[in-house]
């Protein structure tokens, strides 16, 4: 015998309370395949979430984040505040990168500048809060008389370690 529920199309569910007739999914719910005995719950995009795709009777909503925030987690399950380049987000808000670290994006953490000397290279361009250092050729590669740009170590700036 064929299961009567198998005839219920997407957007409906097989209602056991009504002799297994196909009933439309209630508001704010959906079924993406036929033959379902329950409808799934639509995702709601509220607060810092913004609707990228509305829920329909056959497919779930999709959310992204309002301006000033970016998605984190599976399926944009969280929205995290953007910071400026040269900053990272801590529990106390956006904080400037400590001296010797940088962040070239509006999200993520400050990362240490590349240590050029580990690769036997010299610093060609100094690092900033927003940009990594640029390493130049190793001193041995330089033609006689040429000198690498090795700046004096600047005074340490007050930094903020992540809370």
């Amino acid at each position: 015998l064929q299961d009567p529920c198998s005839n219920c199309p997407a957007g409906t569910f097989c209602d056991n309370n009504r002799n297994q007739i196909c009933s439309p999914c209630p508001p704010n719910s959906f079924s993406s395949a036929g033959g379902q005995r329950t409808c799934d719950i639509c995702r709601q995009c509220k607060g810092v979430f913004r609707t990228r795709k509305e829920c329909s009777s056959t497919s779930n909503a999709e959310c992204d984040c309002t301006p000033g925030f970016h998605c984190l987690g599976a399926g944009c399950s969280m929205c995290e505040q953007d910071c400026k380049q040269g900053q990272e987000l801590t529990k106390k808000g956006c904080k400037d990168c400590c001296f010797g670290t940088f962040n070239d994006q509006k999200r993520g953490i400050c990362r240490p500048w590349t240590n050029c000397s580990l690769d036997g290279k010299s610093v060609l361009v100094n690092g900033t809060k927003e940009r990594d250092v640029v390493c130049g050729p190793s001193p041995a590669d330089l033609s006689p008389g040429a000198s690498s740009v090795t700046p004096p170590a600047p005074a340490r700036e007050p930094g903020h370690s992540p809370q």
Partner: antibody, heavy 120, light 112 residues
Framework: QSLVESGGGLVQPGGSLRLSCAAS?????????ICWVRQAPGKGLEWIAC?????????YYASSAKGRFTISRDNSKNTLYLQMNSLRAEDTAVYYC????????????WGQGTLVTVSS | ALVMTQSPSTLSASVGDRVTINCQAS??????LAWYQQKPGKAPKLLIF???DLASGVPSRFSGSGSGTEFTLTISSLQPDDFATYYC??????????????FGGGTKVEIK
């Protein structure tokens, strides 16, 4: 669509157990959260852990589960797992897997549960 | 951590009665609240989601209301099949270091 748990049984304190939750009628490539919820005998429901069975596989744990329990999945088998280590008497419960499509811990599909008994 | 407090813990009622169960969240959870019914030896069954939306296949005598921290489940006319334990659940995904999701302690609706 259904979820079927297995792997429960009697285990000694300090022992380990791996529970399975087999899904049918929907694909683990879908954008669902599947979670483990437990219920001690005669007590209420307690949320334990969740995993996103879409591409990212993000995981979340209740404080009571962190460090001892690990949630994982095998998409090729459409199966979810809960690895439980260093079990204690207070972990004795019926363990349910449940599915959420809302991202807000609202479960419209539940398994029948599997009983875990921790006793010497 | 999010804490859900349900009251009363036990409720005695008769068929045909109007029954109200309350649930309080320790912090504002907007309308991210669900209600479940559970019978002995069975898995919970979703009744209400987003505080007031009726789940598929659930009779219209069940209704939910509230937002923020105060929520209510109402059964307009209690039926023999409704004697069970009811749980509220609130929660949302934040970050792996600070995840919120909690059930209330349950309300057992028994025959008076």
């Amino acid at each position: 669509q259904s979820l079927v748990e297995s792997g429960g049984g009697l285990v000694q304190p300090g022992g380990s157990l791996r529970l399975s939750c087999a899904a049918s009628g929907f694909s683990f490539s879908s954008n669902y959260w599947i979670c483990w919820v437990r219920q001690a005998p005669g007590k209420g429901l307690e949320w334990i852990a969740c995993i996103y069975v879409g591409s990212s596989g993000d995981t979340y744990y209740a404080s009571s589960a962190k460090g001892r329990f690990t949630i994982s999945r095998d998409n090729s088998k459409n199966t979810l797992y809960l690895q439980m280590n260093s079990l204690r008497a207070e972990d004795t419960a019926v363990y349910y897997c449940a599915r959420d499509s809302s991202s807000y811990y609202m479960f419209n599909l539940w398994g029948q549960g599997t009983l875990v008994t921790v006793s010497s | 951590a999010l804490v859900m407090t349900q009251s009363p813990s036990t409720l005695s009622a008769s068929v045909g009665d109007r029954v109200t169960i309350n649930c309080q969240a320790s912090e504002d959870i907007d309308t991210y609240l669900a209600w479940y019914q559970q019978k002995p030896g069975k898995a919970p069954k979703l009744l209400i989601f987003y505080a007031s939306d009726l789940a598929s296949g659930v009779p219209s005598r069940f209704s939910g209301s509230g937002s923020g921290t105060e929520f209510t489940l109402t059964i307009s006319s209690l039926q023999p099949d409704d004697f069970a334990t009811y749980y509220c659940q609130g929660g949302y995904y934040t970050s792996s270091a600070d995840t919120r999701g909690a059930f209330g302690g349950g309300t057992k609706v028994e025959i008076k």
